[in-house]
């Protein structure tokens, strides 16, 4: 196997590799630095393995996976060193590296010249006490949202930031505004920002307006 790659968004984590097998199968093992290797996706002909269940046990740990190749019908086959042939993945630390999924604007509410914009707190596959944690639960204040907003009638964008899931911004009375948000983890060195949310504009069904 080669080109082992971690594909991870909001902690949903898949290991992908090449090539498509012809006459052999794959088994994946994953471990933290403890070296307690756990086998997954036994003798599969797929070239991906969902490792979410393993990495969500502790998203701050660093993981390594390895893909073993076995000739079909002979799961005991070994390389010249007397062991199954395998290749190691790059290291992967979910908390530092999982991609931030595209956020969604849950609602916005205008009261006079103020608008409260709320970002949906997406549920992740990380569990604590048998309940799934939200993105905010996992990242806490490490996660911020950036709001981009502009008058429907112009293209000049303004920005606001929050380390909660809510923004309170000033707007001009009588003007319609459009909004888009982006999730950001400023402390990261990679995968710092999500893609922008879909644009939501005042006058559409997500909004509430009160004088």
């Amino acid at each position: 196997a080669f080109n082992l790659t971690w594909i991870s968004t909001d902690f949903k984590t898949i290991l992908e590799w090449q090539p498509k097998p012809t006459n052999y199968t794959y088994t994946v093992q994953i471990s933290t630095k403890s070296g307690d290797w756990k086998s997954k996706c036994f003798y599969t002909t797929d070239t991906e393995c969902d490792l979410t269940d393993e990495i969500v046990k502790d998203v701050k740990q660093t993981y390594l996976a390895r893909v073993f190749s076995y000739p079909a019908g002979n799961v005991e086959s070994t390389g010249s060193a007397g062991e199954p042939l395998y290749e190691n993945s790059p290291e992967f630390t979910p908390y530092l590296e999982t991609n931030l999924g595209q956020p969604t604007i849950q609602s916005f509410e205008q009261v006079g010249t103020k608008v409260n914009v709320t970002v949906e707190d997406e549920r992740t596959l990380v569990r604590r006490n048998n309940t799934f944690l939200s993105l905010r639960d996992v990242f806490g204040k490490d996660l911020i949202y950036t709001l981009y907003y502009w008058k429907s009638s112009s293209s000049g964008k303004k920005t606001a930031k929050t380390n909660t899931n809510e923004f309170l911004i000033d707007v001009d009375k009588g003007e319609n505004y459009c909004f888009s948000v982006q999730a950001v983890i400023p402390s990261r060195t990679v995968n710092r920002k999500s893609t922008d949310s879909p644009v939501e504009c005042m006058g559409q069904e997500k909004g509430e307006f009160r004088e």
């Epitope: 933290t32 630095k33 403890s34 070296g35 307690d36 290797w37 740990q61």
Partner: antibody, heavy 118, light 106 residues
């Protein structure tokens, strides 16, 4: 500061036994595989054994298989190497090392000397 | 077992020299190689892992390269503190060390 401190070395007769200990501090002991590496006088490094963080997986060099047993007590942050049926060629400085994934050694102890001689 | 062969076994050099040590594996080990430095009477110290990743706190004059069966450790400008013995170690299949390269003062 991450520290490893070996003890238990000494002079032992051929066929005898010895138990080495390695006290770890400065890191979460159970989060890491650990290993033993030895160095005979004037020679190079030789890997001896590795154990996973839970103690569930162990690996041995062919030269010590069946004679040496690696173990750990995570509640005491201590790694052990039980050495039985010792031979003259087991004479060496034995180093304990922290071994991420059981692959390479990123922190080493100062070593303890084992001499097998009659 | 995978055999690791280092060359040269001894290398004479002067402060400021660029020094290169080679390590060959008896079969492909991809990039699963580490380099260590050891001074007399002391424990080894990790310099490089995964063939080219510099361990935290190690001076940038040390670098590693290579993949497959041939690897090099380079010291860009030899310092007085660098006179020591250097070992490579593969971790593709269990663990084996090279025989060591002693870097001595010319």
């Amino acid at each position: 500061e991450v520290q490893l401190l070996e003890s238990g070395g000494g002079l032992v007769q051929p066929g005898g036994s010895l138990r080495l200990s390695c006290a770890a501090s400065g890191f979460t002991f159970s989060d890491y595989a650990m290993g033993w590496v030895r160095q005979a006088p004037g020679k190079g490094l030789e890997w001896v054994s590795t154990i996973s963080g839970s103690g569930g997986l162990t690996y041995y060099a062919d030269s010590v298989k069946g004679r040496f047993t690696i173990s750990r007590d995570n509640s005491k942050n201590t790694l052990y190497l039980q050495m039985n049926s010792l031979r003259a060629e087991d004479t060496a400085v034995y180093y304990c090392a922290k071994a991420p994934y059981g692959y390479y050694m990123d922190v080493w102890g100062k070593g303890t000397t084992v001499t097998v001689s009659s | 077992d995978i055999q690791m062969t280092q060359s040269p076994s001894t290398l004479s050099a002067s402060v400021g020299d660029r020094v290169t040590i080679t390590c060959r594996a008896s079969q492909s080990i991809s990039s699963w190689l580490a380099w260590y430095q050891q001074k007399p009477g002391k424990a080894p110290k990790l310099l490089i892992y995964k063939a080219s990743s510099l361990e935290s706190g190690v001076p940038s004059r040390f670098s590693g390269s290579g993949s497959g069966t041939e690897f090099t450790l380079t010291i860009s400008s030899l310092q007085p503190d660098d006179f020591a013995t250097y070992y490579c170690q593969q971790y593709k299949s269990y663990i084996t060390f090279g025989g060591g390269t002693k870097v001595e003062i010319k």
